[in-house]
Interface confidence: low
Amino acid sequence: RKIPKVGHTFFQKPESCPPVPGGSMKLDIGIINENQRVSMSRNIESRSTSPWNYTVTWDPNRYPSEVVQAQCRNLGCINAQGKEDISMNSVPIQQETLVVRRKHQGCSVSFQLEKVLVTVGCTCVTPVIHHVQ
Amino acid sequence: GITIPRNPGCPNSEDKNFPRTVMVNLNIHNRNTNTNPKRSSDYYNRSTSPWNLHRNEDPERYPSVIWEAKCRHLGCINADGNVDYHMNSVPIQQEILVLRREPPHCPNSFRLEKILVSVGCTCVTPIVHHVA
């Protein structure tokens, strides 16, 4: 079972805590570790047996406004001869992240946290074969 | 949501940048989607570059549980089910945003934090360096 929301009994912990209106929370979007870099192996998206392309989605009312999504290039996987082997499957690997969504309502704006599913890359898997009786 | 008055020029003027600090609604849109990769698919076992999932738990973060992938082999699994060292299993990494309590003891004050997670593994042709 889930407790949805505790009545709006918002409790302040130390005196130094910022006052926050009921039903909301204060979010600093200056990102901790903003400058860390992904040190992935070089162009694995092209060298993979399940290669993928990247598409950048851009939304000015989302923070961050750029989200990169991967798409598998093939249904099958690339074999040692560089040909597509359809006895194997290229499948997307996905990961959730948080974004902040800005919503305009007339002359007011509100902010909402949102979970977004990002396709990160692809991997080659043995297919699940369903036998029909 | 929590409404905040727009700038005085509304509706003509539009602030393109996000403010440094915002008040956000406590409800997270899509917050109940499945976050356990073991339950959502068995790709980690069926992949030619299989991986194990390790639980990274931090109660002062949201989400408090993040699953980290670690490739099981240096090579990839071939058609015979053996490890082929002519190919490499490599992690696919992704930067994600999480919430961190800041200041640490305040119940409703947070900061976004970028963390690097290994989401899964993929099988790649190795880069061969020829020594002159």
Epitope: - | I28, E57, P59, S64, L99, P107
Partner: nanobody
Amino acid sequence: EVQLVESGGGLVQPGGSLRLSCAASGFTFSSYSMYWVRQAPGKGLEWVAEIKQDGSEQYYVDSVKGRFTISRDNAKNSLYLQMNGLRAEDTAVYYCAKGEILPLYFDYWGQGTLVTVSS
């Protein structure tokens, strides 16, 4: 699977005492702040108390300060609420809750134990 089982509720006279217990299993108990939350008849949920992972810090809603004490035993995976000087307005179902850090969203909670304060 995460489980939280409360016990110790009952009927008590005003000014009396009760000790609630919560047995936790299925997660790393010592890694989480734990909470007591209550729901009075016909009312919404009210946060009562929180205790940090190592038990070093406790927080209380104003109406119970000085009367209630939250404690925990990490070796036993147990959470407690010692309730003294009980008043009629403390009558409620008391829940123990394990929470994500997002305030007021508890991802797991028990079935509750009823505390009735009446003469």
